[in-house]
């Protein structure tokens, strides 16, 4: 039975050109994490394999950095980065757990509503 739960950073609103950290945490299970995939829509961004370490997809190499931990840092954000990101935890013996984070990237001028843009 899958007893685990995924906690995420929560949805994030960020400014174009900035950087953000996407993080998920798997809790309430003793299952072993064998691999974590980070995806956006149908695109694979990065893989963190327990044995082989990190692999960043070539098309994202310039703007995606591994970590902290099993998280992912997105840099030089563009409006086109707006969308839903998935952290997919492959575990044994439980199977797959998925977390979801929505990232909204706004033009600098959209401080019109006073949204707080923070760059870690």
């Amino acid at each position: 039975m899958m007893t685990g739960t995924i906690e995420t950073t929560g949805n994030i609103s960020a400014e174009k050109g900035g950087s953000i950290i996407l993080q998920c945490h798997l809790s309430s299970t003793t299952a072993q994490v064998t691999q974590v995939n980070w995806e956006q829509q149908d695109q694979l961004l990065a893989i963190c394999n327990a044995d082989l370490g990190w692999h960043i997809s070539p098309s994202f190499k310039d703007r995606v950095a591994p970590g902290p931990g099993l998280g992912l840092t997105l840099q030089s954000l563009t409006v086109n980065d707006t969308g839903e990101y998935f952290c997919i935890y492959h575990t044994y013996p439980d199977g797959t757990y998925t977390g979801r984070i929505f990232l909204e990237v706004l033009e600098s001028s959209v401080a019109e509503h006073g949204a707080r843009f923070q760059i870690p």
Partner: antibody, heavy 119, light 112 residues
Framework: EVQLQQSGPELVKPGASVKISCKAS????????MNWVKQSHGKNLEWIGL????????SYNQKFKDKATLTIDKSSSTAYMELLSLTSEDSAVYYC????????????WGQGTSVTVSS | DVVVTQTPLSLPVSFGDQVSISCRSS???????????LSWYLHKPGQSPQLLIY???NRFSGVPDRFSGSGSGTNFTLKISTIKPEDLGVYYC?????????FGGGTKLEIK
């Protein structure tokens, strides 16, 4: 003035599909997400999902993943929601609502489209 | 999914009353950057819902200052300082911090 004009009421048979439209005006259509919300029994509100006109990306409430398909037509500033394999449980009022940038909320709503599923 | 619980379900009022509506979530609505995405809406009979408050406490354009929002973490409150006839309807809170977004069950403000 921001306006979201939805298509008219629909009476459909169980098992059929229906496509609701939401025509946006008074703002830059590609600059804001478009959300869809279901209201059943006159009270409960449920977020179905959203579409990003800028890049075509979508985010669905998993409950509606196999029920609703969100699309857009940029040229006419119109968002669409197709509801599939309809049952009586899908009888409700459906709203489109513009995303409120920076706050994960919605600011302007369409007038709603009533969908009745009945044989 | 995050469960959002609104209380009370129904709120009988008299014009001029001050009222509070509570919204509680099953997990914190503050993201890792310290932002909290909790908004409030009023759905009047025969109309579409309208945005009142966003980001816990910010009044949307044109919303009277008798409406105020407060709270943090998992507990949030909408206060209406002096009830007027146009305030009657169903109030909803919405959390947008976690996917999927979820609404509270609604609070019906009605005349005693």
């Amino acid at each position: 003035e921001v306006q979201l004009q939805q298509s008219g009421p629909e009476l459909v048979k169980p098992g059929a599909s229906v496509k609701i439209s939401c025509k946006a005006s008074g703002y830059s259509f590609t600059g804001y997400t478009m959300n869809w919300v279901k209201q059943s029994h006159g009270k409960n509100l449920e977020w179905i999902g959203l579409i990003i006109p800028y890049n075509g990306g979508t985010s669905y409430n998993q409950k509606f993943k196999d029920k609703a398909t969100l699309t857009i037509d940029k040229s006419s500033s119109t968002a669409y929601m197709e509801l599939l394999s309809l049952t009586s449980e899908d009888s409700a009022v459906y709203y489109c609502a513009r995303g409120f940038r920076g706050y994960f909320a919605v600011d302007y709503w369409g007038q709603g489209t009533s969908v009745t599923v009945s044989s | 999914d995050v469960v959002v619980t609104q209380t009370p379900l129904s709120l009988p009022v008299s014009f001029g009353d001050q009222v509070s509506i509570s919204c509680r979530s099953s997990q914190s609505l503050t993201n890792s950057y310290g932002d909290t995405y909790l908004s409030w809406y009023l759905h009047k009979p025969g109309q579409s819902p309208q945005l009142l408050i966003y980001g816990i406490s910010n009044r949307f354009s044109g919303v009277p200052d008798r409406f105020s929002g407060s709270g943090s973490g998992t507990n949030f409150t909408l206060k209406i300082s002096t009830i007027k006839p146009e305030d009657l309807g169903v109030y909803y809170c919405l959390q947008g911090t976690h996917q999927p977004w979820t609404f509270g069950g609604g609070t019906k403000l009605e005349i005693k």
